[in-house]
């Protein structure tokens, strides 16, 4: 089988501070040394890119400085964290993995993680 399987949790609840973390694990059919991981958000039929990082196996994941994502890698497993989430960001977040080098190229698309974000209630004013 030449397809690459990508596994990610079905549901994750963001913290009250708007932070959600999940693991994206891929079964590599080859010995990849350079991998690109992209987080996509699917809302209705629209798919948008949330963040992306390319890394060398054994090295750390480096997202752009202004990215809302951070992550670490260990073997064929990537631990992703998305920050700054609000209730309106609730949706399906898909992990996409591309084995860029060496050949052959492989694409892996996860089934998506439904991230639920609940905006914290504002603190009531105290009467003293």
């Amino acid at each position: 089988c030449k397809a690459m399987h990508v596994a990610q949790p079905a549901v994750v609840l963001a913290s009250s501070r708007g932070i959600a973390s999940f693991v994206c694990e891929y079964a590599s059919p080859g010995k990849a040394t350079e991998v690109r991981v992209t987080v996509l958000r699917q809302a209705d039929s629209q798919v948008t890119e949330v963040c992306a990082a390319t890394y060398m196996m054994g090295n750390e994941l480096t997202f752009l400085d202004d990215s809302i994502c951070t992550g670490t890698s260990s073997g064929n497993q990537v631990n992703l964290t998305i920050q700054g989430l609000r209730a309106m960001d609730t949706g399906l977040y898909i992990c996409k993995v591309e084995l860029m080098y060496p050949p052959p190229y492989y694409l892996g698309i996860g089934n998506g993680t439904q991230i639920y974000v609940i905006d914290p209630e504002p603190c009531p004013d105290s009467d003293f």
Partner: antibody, heavy 118, light 108 residues
Framework: EVQLVESGGGLVKPGGSLRLSCAAS????????MHWVRQAPGKGLEWVSF????????YYADSVKGRFTISRDNAKNSLYLQMNSLRAEDTAVYYC???????????WGQGTMVTVSS | EIVLTQSPGTLSVSPGERATLSCRAS???????LAWYQQKPGQAPRLLIY???SRATGIPDRFSGSGSGTDFTLTISRLEPEDFAVYYC?????????FGQGTKVEIK
């Protein structure tokens, strides 16, 4: 408007060279991998080449390996295909295509005709 | 290389009838990585179906895809005059990216 427009096709003699261009507009070009696909007259679609987001990774069909070179200029929103040592069997309409975020080719140019003949 | 074989080569159907096109892969293709395209004479291909069964933006619901592993199907439930064209399947899960040889859907 989201579109791809190819140019640079024409008539060339066997052994000659040609450079195809593909101008992208209406989307963030650097966020997409790109391909060249060709179609010989009356035949089916044949994938030719792939280039990654930043141009660091390139793949080629065996039929063009060593003769064709794909490149991109993200500052100019442009994709290129340098074709050397052209053969009669390279005669085809050449399309540039965008890889959608989920993998299939969701946007195609109108194509440019390359004819290799003496 | 994954070889995709489409059948039949030509399908003669009357408008309003159902058309069923087949695509068989030489080895297993994950359903997330199988697409169908439509091409009319003198035009570029147009993406119809991706991920084996998801319709691309703007594609009418008379087009549907199914299948998994090595066997995939494109079904056009009621052929409209504009549906007579050549249809290609494609796998995009690994390089080299490959297309089937095409099925021509013609008016009976």
């Amino acid at each position: 408007e989201v579109q791809l427009v190819e140019s640079g096709g024409g008539l060339v003699k066997p052994g000659g060279s040609l450079r195809l261009s593909c101008a992208a507009s209406g989307f963030t070009f650097s966020s997409y991998t790109m391909h060249w696909v060709r179609q010989a007259p009356g035949k089916g679609l044949e994938w030719v080449s792939f280039i990654s987001y930043d141009g660091n990774y390139k793949y080629y069909a065996d039929s063009v390996k060593g003769r064709f070179t794909i490149s991109r200029d993200n500052a100019k929103n442009s994709l290129y295909l340098q074709m050397n040592s052209l053969r009669a069997e390279d005669t085809a309409v050449y399309y540039c295509a965008r890889t959608s975020l989920l993998g299939p080719f969701d946007l195609w140019g109108q194509g440019t005709m390359v004819t290799v003949s003496s | 290389e994954i070889v995709l074989t489409q059948s039949p080569g030509t399908l003669s159907v009357s408008p309003g009838e159902r058309a069923t096109l087949s695509c068989r892969a030489s080895q297993s293709v994950g359903s997330s990585y199988l697409a169908w395209y439509q091409q009319k004479p003198g035009q570029a291909p147009r993406l119809l179906i991706y991920g084996a069964f998801s319709r691309a933006t703007g594609i009418p619901d008379r087009f549907s895809g199914s299948g998994s592993g090595t066997d995939f199907t494109l079904t056009i439930s009621r052929l409209e005059p504009e549906d007579f064209a050549v249809y290609y399947c494609q796998q995009y899960g690994s390089s080299p990216w490959t297309f089937g040889q095409g099925t021509k859907v013609e008016i009976k």
